[in-house]
Interface confidence: low
């Protein structure tokens, strides 16, 4: 909780959690109770802090720019708005989350720039033949989807260095000389046709292309992708259009440090290096780009990659596409016969998805997304909507929180993959207290100016301490705060101010005593309850409430439950301990020691029952039952019984006989008489 966080300043208090507030009201607490100023706003109000003195900054969203989403066709593509809002400031209280809603709508008839990047290694000869009319066919199909379509063309083979190419003069001039066939010298990347709406020009360019060759199977296509993405002006990418890069190949691609084989060790710099002939001039100088570098530049330039690759390569490029935002893979027939349908399908797939990406200074920031897609369906922890129709709106709840109070603001961009539109977000921490602006330096409230007064408390100058800086260094001896010289100051549970202990607050109860040596929570427990819940804990000992006694206060002093029916405590056969009889007499039992078959003279008390039993014959024995009941006994004829704990009796009968029997006790404490017999009876007179 806020109050237990030990905050001594307003800023420390706000850092404990978003639920905490600080009371800057003067004289709000006892001088030592600085920590009491930090609590929930409700608790501070309840404690008497006036509302205008409660420092409790809240997270807030300030929208700077929120143009409505474009609906229908726009005359000017620069007027198109596909994300709303476009700019906002988020003031966040550390630990407190703020949710904002972002809406994305792919506008109808959005301009499309498509750059056709083709592998021109020898195996692509048949493909080159197939696509000679692709420009006009593609323009015709795309005109059904957009009224503003442009096409461009570039080609690639491989870095023209050993061991990727053969280096004899003959094979450098004609890498196909061993076939024999004429093909162009190996090249890295050539940008041939900037983006244009002239489809016939595209056809013409394609017809003029010649294949080239290299040795190993992987090609240098990633070098070409990097140049096509970053050479924005030369390629002709427009600001307000969908940028599609169609990568056509039948082989894998080299990346990263593969070029070390050729002694090329300078990392790719991600910059445009097209010379005056629009050829990649650093092909033999810079390493292939890494996948990470490609991702950065494709995202930065809003380029959506369509891998059109043959069957053997599909799996490989699917793995690359998983890593590259917005990338798709299409299966290319051996001769590129299905390239048109592949491009149209990929375009439709891209247009049916809206996915957000986050760029900028996000480290340590907690961002979570919920996508709200078709028909308002919520997808938690997702930032992508699929199966959308162009013109549909996708919404996203974005929840942001910062864990702690950093001193900087962060700039973040949330944008749909492949679109230029973005939401710019400035996240700034909200942790300052307004009361900190009003500082009374050398304040008289701080004992003759020994400190500065702000936010209701004193910040003491060096050499002074105490709630009002009233304690100088000469008064800082802690000896009077120690119970014994080797004991910690204030028992380690308080602060020594000017020779006196001010005990800490504790979540468990009160700490008190001149040395904070006492508390009301460190006593013994009975059944998990402090002092059995029948007493108060005072400095480690239970002080029992009225009616209770014992170390644990679990012993009642009442004797009511010990009094037997005859009004005698424990029937006079035991002691009343903790409200229960502890029977002292052997054989005594029962809640009040009322059962005791062996008490008094057990044998003689059964005489009337025994004699009746012996003198009666047959049916007359029934008459004895009442006599036996009065004597608290029953007679058993059973011979098989336990003799443990039995009492053996001998009585002189009326006829001078010796009567012997045994008494046992049943579970209810009643007497049972066994083995009755008469002995030594006098013989009757011998009368003839």
């Amino acid at each position: 909780g806020c109050a237990l966080g030990g905050a001594e300043t307003c800023e420390d208090c706000l850092l404990i959690g978003p639920q905490c507030a600080w009371c800057a009201q003067e004289n709000f607490t006892r001088p030592s109770g600085v920590g009491e100023r930090c609590d929930t706003p409700a608790n501070l109000l309840a404690k008497g802090c006036q509302l205008n003195f409660i420092e409790n900054p809240v997270s807030q969203v300030e929208i700077l720019k929120n143009k409505p989403l474009s609906v229908g066709r726009q005359k000017n593509s620069s007027d198109i708005v596909q994300i709303a809002p476009q700019s906002l400031i988020l003031k966040l209280r550390p630990g407190g989350a703020q949710t904002l809603q972002v809406h994305v709508r792919q506008t109808e008839d959005y301009p499309v720039d498509l750059y056709y990047l083709m592998d021109l290694s020898a195996s692509m000869d048949d493909d080159l033949n197939t696509i000679k009319e692709l420009g006009s066919r593609l323009s015709k199909e795309m005109s059904k989807l957009t009224s503003n379509f442009r096409l461009g063309f570039g080609s690639f083979v491989e870095k023209p260095v050993s061991p990727f190419v053969k280096t004899t003069p003959e094979e450098i001039a004609n890498p196909c000389s061993s076939i024999p066939y004429f093909c162009l010298p190996t090249f890295g990347f050539k940008h041939i046709l900037p983006l244009t709406n002239d489809a016939e020009r595209f056809n013409e360019i394609v017809k003029n292309q010649k294949i080239s060759a290299n040795i190993d199977t992987p090609e240098g296509g990633f070098d070409a992708i990097m140049q096509a993405a970053v050479c924005k002006e030369k390629i002709g990418w427009r600001n307000d259009s969908l940028h599609l890069l169609v990568f056509v190949s039948d082989a894998d691609s080299h990346f990263g440090m593969d070029s070390k084989l050729a002694g090329i060790v300078i990392p790719n710099d991600g910059l445009c290096h097209l010379d005056s002939k629009n050829e990649y001039s650093m092909s033999t100088v810079l390493e292939y780009p890494t996948i990470g570098q490609l991702i950065d530049k494709l995202v930065q330039n809003n380029v959506l990659l369509i891998f059109a690759v043959t069957q053997e390569q599909v799996h490989l490029y699917e793995n690359y596409a998983k890593l590259i935002p917005g990338a798709t893979v299409g299966l290319l027939q051996k001769d590129s016969g299905n390239i048109l349908q592949l491009i149209i399908s990929a375009y439709e797939e891209l247009r049916s998805e809206v996915e957000l990406e986050v760029l900028g200074d996000t480290e340590g920031l907690n961002l979570s997304f919920t996508a709200i897609c078709n028909n308002g369906t919520f997808f938690q922890h997702q930032k992508k909507c699929s199966h959308m129709k162009v013109g549909d709106t996708a919404s996203f709840n974005v929840t942001v929180n910062i864990p702690n109070c950093e001193r900087r603001s962060r700039h973040i961009i949330i944008k749909p993959v492949g679109l230029g539109d973005a939401l710019e977000l400035l996240v700034s921490p909200e942790c300052n207290c307004d009361c900190q602006k009003e500082v009374e330096v050398n304040s008289s409230k701080c004992h003759h100016g020994n400190g500065s007064f702000q936010c209701g408390v004193c910040a003491c100058h060096p050499g002074h301490m105490g709630p009002r800086c009233e304690c100088g260094e000469d008064m800082l001896s802690t000896d009077s705060c120690k119970e014994a010289p080797d004991h910690p100051s204030c028992s380690g549970r308080g602060d020594c101010y000017c020779g006196q202990c001010i005990c800490h607050l504790s979540p468990y109860g009160n700490i008190y005593g001149p040395y904070c040596q006492c508390d009301n929570f460190s006593c013994v427990r009975h059944k998990g309850l402090l002092c059995g819940d029948n007493g108060d804990c005072d400095c480690g000992e239970c002080v029992c409430r009225s009616g209770w006694t014992g170390e644990y206060c679990n012993c009642t002093t009442s004797t009511d439950s010990c009094v037997s029916e005859d009004g005698v405590l424990c029937s006079g056969r035991g002691d009343c301990v903790c409200g229960k009889c502890v029977c002292a007499n052997p054989g005594a039992s029962g809640p009040t020691c009322e059962r005791c078959p062996t008490c008094g003279d057990p044998c003689n008390s059964k005489r009337s029952c025994i004699e009746c039993h012996l003198s009666a014959a047959g049916q007359a024995r029934e008459e004895c039952v009442d006599k036996c009941k009065l004597a608290g006994a029953t007679i058993s004829e059973e011979e098989d019984f336990s003799k443990d704990g039995s009492v053996s009796c001998s009585l002189q009968g009326e006829n001078e006989c010796l009567i012997t029997f045994l008494i046992t006790t049943d579970n209810e404490g009643k007497s049972i008489i066994h083995s009755i017999s008469e002995k030594d009876c006098p013989k009757p007179p011998n009368i003839p």
Epitope: L4, G5, G6, D12, L15, P403, N404, C405, P488, G492, R493, G494, D495, H504, L505, S506, P507, Y508, G509, D519, F521, S522, V524, R525, G528
Partner: antibody
């Protein structure tokens, strides 16, 4: 003078449960002033906090071990115990029990009393 | 969790020299909840400093602690032979409690 003594098997088989007990002598385990703590140290490495228990039974565990660790207290025996399930060779370490002053307020003390430690090896 | 980073990893000094050990927290912590411990081979750690600057019982005054916020320092003004050991800082202001990785002070 409070003293702590760890006890338990020195060898535990992989996938089994490691069980250690710490006995408190010379002072009360039922004081409201202390957290009773377990810490371990892998061979040649630094110290890793496992968790603590308050005499009332409330606990706090290291998130990295939370799913496998249980700390319990028996105030009548003045003991607190550590159970670590599904152990692997990575749990081989010296295990210490220690006493810590409470978290809130200016209970400055930190881990002021330590046991001498017990070595536990996890091996089949 | 709060990450504590100690530097240097090893400090090679001669007896009589001054040792300065640093402990940096990944986020602001209250100095009330920072401690320093000394550990010698085969022994349990021994408390030296609590509350960033208060010496534990029986600790000689050549050991002193200072710092606040994210930067804390343990200073040994004149190294004695028995001071060569590993020193750890620890925060106990929030769970999980965390230790620094340790600084070894060895004889040069």
């Amino acid at each position: 003078q409070v003293q702590l003594q760890e006890s338990g098997p020195g060898l535990v088989k992989p996938s089994q449960t490691l069980s250690l007990t710490c006995t408190v002598s010379g002072g009360s385990i039922s004081s409201g002033v202390y957290y009773w703590t377990w810490i371990r140290q892998h061979p040649g490495n630094g110290l890793e906090w496992i968790g603590y228990i308050y005499y009332s039974g409330s606990t706090s565990y290291n998130p990295s071990l939370k799913s496998r660790v249980t700390i319990s207290v028996d105030t009548s025996k003045k003991q607190f115990s550590l159970n670590l399930t599904s152990v692997t060779a990575a749990d081989t370490a010296v295990y210490y029990c220690a006493r810590e002053g409470p978290l809130r307020g200016d209970y400055y003390y930190g881990l002021d009393v330590w046991g001498q430690g017990t070595t536990v090896t996890v091996s089949s | 969790e709060i990450v504590l980073t100690q530097s240097p990893g090893t400090l090679s000094l001669s007896p009589g020299e001054r040792a300065t050990l640093s402990c940096r927290a990944g986020q602001t912590i209250s100095s009330r909840y920072l401690a320093w411990y000394q550990q010698k081979p085969g022994q349990a750690p021994r408390p030296l400093i609590y509350g960033a600057s208060s010496r534990a019982t029986g600790i000689p005054d050549r050991f002193s602690g200072s710092g606040s916020g994210t930067d804390f320092t343990l200073t040994i003004s004149r190294l004695e032979p028995e001071d060569f050991a590993v020193y750890y800082c620890q925060q106990y202001g929030s769970s999980p409690r965390t230790f620094g990785q340790g600084t070894k002070v060895e004889i040069k």
